[in-house]
């Protein structure tokens, strides 16, 4: 059962796991959400009556009844872990922690103008959990405006104290502020020789590097495939660190595996969501229950649902036993990952799907597109909306581009002469204009938020966000599409789409079918030299075939500029400008979205 | 053991510049700043400015600025002060001070080590 | 910028005597003051700092105390190798600056 509210002057007796400091019972809370065996925790806040040694610890609990005693103590704050709810959960910190100094391993200090500046070196700088900023009010005149960059094993601060003028904060890498490089490749036949900070057993390099990336001192990692030659280091994934933040040597070496943390690019990838299967293989662990099943995604199915269960075991039954049900092993163990992985035994093995909550909506995969034609197919397009005027009479005016429960991304320019959010309305999950009747259900806009530096769609900024009046249930039909990293800045896409229901050809009418069509980028030194005209700057994508023929139109504006990476698709371009439609050598223009993430980012994440 | 040691006695001539070094050991060079205090002959000390050898920030004060150029060289932990456009009241001994441990906030603090010091003697 | 103020200039004490030393600031510099000792021909030496603790090595025969604008290094039995020239600095605000000098001599 998810039980979100906090329990004030009450602390659960027993099941400590471990203790940690934290600023607050709201971060306290987030701790154990992402602690692989933590349900509940008790935070002790500052306070006369308590012992100051014990203020801001986070006792991180556990239970097999997933409950504990509870007992009155003031200063105390106990609650439960989110692993028992269905919402989305984010590690994103933002909070500014006044007269309060987190320590940790203090690697790097620098001058700061403000606390914010401070916060964006740590968030962009490999190594650093979290930070402690001197005011100028601070005493020490040396140490006014000091941004100190700090780090330390478990990326939660070592101990919490008070310290006047002075504040602290977190890393916003888990909030996709970073601008550091998003390396996604696994190179093979590599082994990064760099010290280990930990290891665990993982079935393949991909579930390495996703462990990796949510291990808060990994910055890359070397895995031993199935076929290593010393078998006690087979399936052994290696988390690694380096002062550099980079690994010093690669060595050649046949059947291992080694990549980068996904750190900077977390929001865009999933790193918690591990969904395969894994055949003829035994994951190893303590056993929580075995329960009969009719399939291995019957069994994944009651791991998911058993809170405690974090991998597990499925035989198949032998011919006609058990009514054709197998056995399912339920387990867990004190870092989420297999104690052992075993091979040719016949099981099939897996993780639990509890933590995908954990990765962002739009990391999931969709279904298969349907490969030529121009007419889409329901589904096809999950974030594409199509935003409606009701004045003087309703029609389609714009697309748009689901990236938040509430939040729809479009063009600036699609609302000239659009006085009043109330006379839009926006409609997602669909394929046909024709299926909008009057009885259609439509998100309100509560609030247009167009770029404050816009002024027209061929001079850029032509960036706008709709604020809906309620939040978008993702389904199948409906669901966001990711950001761009700001670390994947230098990726050079090849898979990308526009789509729309706009004009087909520059005299035309709005189509009744949501239209695709595949577009090559084209870069900016290209783009300049057909818009000789205009200014083409690095807030705007091009794309376009040399000859034609295909490009966005009339009634595609606001609309998206999906592009296929690494199986996510990303949200690179909204459809801005260009001459005319479908010209030669006139390629369309795009608003380039990955250069307003922080713009983005600020407006929807706003208090 | 903690040291600073400054390179040796100069003479110049007015309107020259001069460069005095100072080399520090037995502690982590780019943890603590750095200050450049000089003492005229016979007269009390007078603060010239400080350098982050981190990051390399300075600052000056007011009655040096833009004759004084605070320089470091992490590699060889050495921080460096440049003075120009010398003139007789330029002679004195210029010391290096080592000043708070950037790396750590706390409140109060002092110049703990000194260097042996330059005499710099400007006459024409 | 700060005016550091020592007085007297010159201290006539004789050994195992107190021997106290005044420093006023022209405007308050909390408790971000701090005390050196020179001898002729060597570099200062850190005393005290903060106002009133006193650094590695230093005896506690050397106390600092006061804040604000009003400070006071007391020596309280001097001895023979304490004969020297005593300064305070300020370290609150930019520029930093230090006082004139107390010259302590044998009396």
């Known amino acids: 059962e998810c039980v979100t509210q906090l329990l004030k002057d009450t602390c659960f007796e027993g099941g400590d796991i471990t203790t940690v400091f934290t600023p607050s019972a709201k971060y306290c809370q987030v701790v154990c959400t992402y602690h692989p065996r933590c349900l509940l925790f008790t935070f002790t806040a500052e306070s006369p009556s308590e012992d100051p040694t014990r203020w801001f610890t986070c006792v991180l609990k556990d239970s097999v009844t997933e409950t504990l005693p509870r007992v009155n103590r003031t200063a105390a704050i106990s609650g439960y872990s989110f692993k028992q709810c269905s919402h989305q959960i984010s590690a994103c910190n933002k909070d500014i922690y006044v007269d309060l100094d987190m320590k940790g391993i203090n690697y790097n200090s620098s001058v700061a103008k403000s606390a914010q500046e401070c916060q964006e070196r740590c968030t962009d700088d490999v190594h650093c959990h979290f930070f402690t900023y001197a005011t100028r009010q601070f005493p020490s005149l040396e140490h006014r405006n000091i941004c100190l960059l700090k780090h330390t094993q478990t990326g939660t601060p070592t101990r919490i104290t008070k310290l006047d003028k002075v504040v602290s904060g977190f890393s916003l890498k888990s909030c996709a502020l970073s601008n550091l490089a998003c390396i996604r490749d696994i190179f093979p036949n590599t082994v990064f020789a760099d010290s280990n900070i930990d290891s665990v057993m993982a079935p393949d390099a991909f579930v390495c590097g996703r462990i990796c990336t949510h291990h808060p001192g990994c910055l890359f990692f070397t895995f031993f495939s199935q076929e290593w030659p010393k078998e006690s280091q087979r399936n052994l994934c290696l988390l690694k660190t380096s002062e550099s933040g980079l690994p010093s040597t690669r060595i050649k070496k046949s059947k291992a595996l080694s990549g980068f943390s996904l750190q900077s690019c977390r929001h865009s990838i999933p790193v918690f969501c591990h969904s395969s299967f894994y055949h003829d293989t035994d994951f190893l662990g303590e056993e929580l229950d075995i329960v009969a099943a009719k399939s291995h995604e019957a069994c994944q199915k009651l791991c998911t649902n058993a809170v405690r269960c974090q991998f597990f075991t499925y035989t198949p039954a032998q011919a006609s036993c058990n009514e054709g049900k197998g056995k399912c092993y339920l387990k867990l163990s004190s870092n989420g990952s297999p104690t052992k992985i075993l091979h040719g035994r016949g099981g099939i093995s897996g993780y639990t799907l509890r933590l995908c909550k954990m990765d962002n909506e739009c990391t999931t995969k969709i279904k298969p597109r349907i490969v030529g034609g121009t007419a889409s197919v329901r589904g096809e397009w999950p974030w594409q909306v199509t935003l409606h005027t009701t004045s003087p009479t309703q029609r389609h005016l714009c697309g748009g581009s689901i990236i938040g429960n509430q939040w729809i991304l479009t063009a600036a320019h699609c609302f000239y002469g659009v006085e009043s959010p109330k006379i839009l309305r926006v409609y997602s999950g669909i394929l046909n204009q024709s299926e909008i009747k009057e009885d259609t259900s439509f998100f309100g806009v509560q609030e247009i938020i167009i770029h404050d530096q816009y002024k027209m769609a061929e001079s850029g900024y032509d960036i706008a966000l709709l604020k809906l009046e309620t939040t978008v249930n993702y389904t199948d039909s409906q669901r966001p599409i990711c950001l761009p990293s700001k670390g994947d800045r230098n990726v050079i896409y090849t898979d990308c789409w526009v789509t729309g229901w706009g004009y087909r050809k520059l005299r035309d009418k709005i189509q009744n079918t949501l239209q695709k069509a595949k577009i090559p980028l084209v870069t900016n030194e290209e783009c300049q030299k057909r818009y000789r005209g205009h200014k083409i700057t690095h807030k705007m994508i091009c794309a376009g075939y040399r000859e034609g023929g295909k490009d966005a139109c009339k009634g595609d504006s606001g609309g998206p500029l999906s592009c296929k990476h690494n199986e996510v698709w990303h949200l690179v371009g909204i459809t801005s400008w260009g001459e005319g439609c479908a010209q030669r050598e006139r390629p369309g223009v795009y608003t380039n979205v990955v250069e307003y993430v922080d713009w983005i980012l600020e407006k929807t994440q706003a208090v | 053991e903690v040291q600073l040691v400054q390179s040796g006695a100069e003479v110049k001539k007015p309107g020259a510049s001069v460069k005095v070094s100072c080399k520090a050991s037995g502690y982590t060079f780019t943890s603590y700043s750095m200050h450049w205090v000089r003492q005229a002959p016979g007269q009390g000390l007078e603060w010239m400015g400080i350098i982050n050898p981190s990051g390399g920030s300075t600052s000056y004060a007011q009655k040096f600025q833009g004759r004084v150029t605070m320089t470091r060289d992490t590699s060889t932990s050495t921080v460096y002060m440049e003075l120009s456009s010398l003139r007789s009241e330029d002679t004195a001994v210029y010391y290096c001070?080592?000043?708070?441990?950037?790396?750590?906030?706390?409140?109060?603090?002092?110049?703990?080590?000194w260097g042996q010091g330059t005499t710099v003697t400007v006459s024409s | 910028e700060i005016v550091m103020t020592q007085s007297p200039a010159t201290l006539s004490v004789s050994p195992g005597e107190r021997a106290t030393l005044s420093c006023r600031a022209s405007q308050s510099v909390s408790s971000n003051l701090a005390w050196y000792q020179q001898k002729p021909g060597q570099a200062p030496r850190l005393l005290i700092y903060g106002a009133s603790t006193r650094a590695t090595g230093i005896p506690a025969r050397f106390s600092g105390s006061g804040s604000g604008t009003e400070f006071t290094l007391t020596i309280s039995s001097l001895q023979s190798e304490d004969f020297a020239v005593y300064y305070c600095?300020?370290?609150?605000?930019?520029?930093?600056?230090f006082g004139g000098g107390t010259k302590v001599e044998i009396k």
């Open positions: 600095q300020q370290f609150n605000d930019w520029p930093l600056t």
């Open positions: 001070a080592r000043g708070a441990y950037l790396l750590e906030l706390y409140y109060y603090y002092g110049m703990d080590v």
